[in-house]
Interface confidence: low
């Protein structure tokens, strides 16, 4: 509430998050030409990645390219990489869309498909759709604890969203538990009218807004956060404009003294915590 006599000051804030939860992941892998179903358990270290600023990331889906090493191999077949003879390939050419540097040779990829040979991390990552349903679909049951310290230096006032005596086993609910700092990821999506399982396939960006409207006058003192949620990525983006949220990272290892890597295309949800508000004092 705006009191004309109050001196207003914007909030200064720091945020720290802790994600908890375990997911059982069922991956289909091909070994010696035979499809196998592999069950593995993913914990926090497997599905979260350190981010800068007031953000945290939860992996919900992935595509793996295993056993890559630096050498020559055919490009993955696409309209741009298919060829019928060496004339269709340009030595030294680096297409921004490509995964390597062309050698100038047109070689067999598979069957009667020929593509330009490249010097790259091989085998080249396949152009594949993200798995459906998402491999870590159960991430909707993960929880995140948000620790938010705020400061109004001009008013010499500091507080935080977690007060002593808070029941740390609580789960946030808009009406029944609006001060609980522990959020179930699936509930955040429900609040914005989005389906977690749908977003988990391609990834997305979700905003967690923490609004502090603080009255710091002694007689009317009130300074508690109000949480709300907002979907930040464009849900309507068509395929050509790269929907969702993904990035690639690699796990490096050595095999027979040859450096190799497993390339992982990670899809997931980036949560941006947006803290704003003011503190007013007479």
């Amino acid at each position: 509430s705006d009191k004309l006599y109050q001196r207003k000051e914007p909030v200064i804030s720091s945020v720290h998050t802790k994600v908890k939860g375990i997911a059982e992941v069922k991956e289909e892998i091909v070994e010696n030409g035979v499809k196998k179903l592999v069950h593995s358990v993913f914990d926090t270290a497997d599905y979260t990645f350190p981010l800068q600023g007031n953000s945290f990331f939860v992996m919900t889906n992935f595509l793996k390219t295993e056993g890559q090493e630096q050498r020559l191999c055919p490009e993955y077949p696409t309209r741009r990489t298919l060829c019928s003879s060496d004339r269709g390939c340009k030595k030294g050419w680096m297409d921004p869309q490509s995964k390597g540097i062309q050698t100038g040779r047109c070689v067999v990829y598979e069957g009667n498909q020929k593509t330009c040979e490249v010097s790259a991390w091989c085998p080249i990552e396949a152009v594949e759709e993200a798995p459906r349903p998402a491999l870590l679909n159960s991430a909707e049951n993960f929880t995140v604890l948000i620790k938010n310290n705020i400061d109004f230096p001009g008013h010499n006032y500091t507080t935080r969203n977690i007060l002593p005596g808070l029941n740390i086993t609580c789960t946030f609910h808009k009406t029944q538990n609006p001060q609980c700092p522990i959020f179930r990821l699936g509930d955040i999506f429900r609040e914005t009218g989005d389906n977690f399982s749908d977003v988990a396939i391609q990834g997305g960006i979700m905003g967690i807004e923490i609004y502090w409207d603080c009255n710091l006058d002694r007689w009317f003192h009130h300074c508690r956060p109000k949480y709300s949620f907002r979907r930040l990525d464009d849900k309507t983006t068509n395929v050509s404009l790269y929907p969702g949220y993904n990035f690639r990272y690699a796990k490096y290892y050595k095999e027979n003294n040859v450096e190799k890597r497993t390339l992982i295309k990670v899809f997931g949800i980036r949560f941006d915590i947006l803290v704003f508000g003011t503190g007013g004092k007479f």
Epitope: E31, N32, R71, C73, V108, Y109, P123, E255
Partner: nanobody, 130 residues
Framework: EVQLVESGGKLVQAGGSLRLSCSAS??????????MGWFRQAPGKELEFVAA????????YYADSVKGRFIISRHNPRNSVYLQLNSLKPEDTAVYYC?????????????????????WGQGTQVTVSS
């Protein structure tokens, strides 16, 4: 367990010919979806790529030093790969190894690197005298 067995190596005169054979056996090995290669190692020298044949379209690849003289071929029903050595030179003297790589998905095609191949034979000696 996959086994590759080479045969056909012997002593020949320079300018002569030889045919090396390699047969593959083993329950886990799918011969029709593998890359087969020949490598050689001369005394005191590194392992050297000779030739390879791709499982798809029977595409063949050769080292520059043997191009036009050696011919690699394969016979799927017999699970065999052959290397025909023509116009032999003394510098072709080496132990010749058969190698195989069973690929589970497309993309790996750097035939002249030994690290590509996961199965190897014991080798057969070829000696070319002048």
């Amino acid at each position: 367990e996959v086994q590759l067995v080479e045969s056909g190596g012997k002593l020949v005169q320079a300018g002569g010919s030889l045919r090396l054979s390699c047969s593959a056996s083993g329950r886990t090995f799918s011969f029709s979806t593998s890359t087969m290669g020949w490598f050689r190692q001369a005394p005191g020298k590194e392992l050297e790529f000779v030739a390879a044949i791709d499982w798809s379209d029977f595409n063949t690849y050769y080292a520059d030093s043997v191009k036009g003289r050696f011919i690699i071929s394969r016979h799927n029903p017999r699970n065999s790969v052959y290397l025909q050595l023509n116009s032999l030179k003394p510098e072709d003297t080496a132990v010749y190894y058969c190698a195989a790589h069973s690929e589970t998905r497309g993309g790996t095609r750097y035939f002249d690197r030994p690290s590509l191949y996961n199965y190897w034979g014991q080798g057969t000696q070829v000696t070319v005298s002048s």
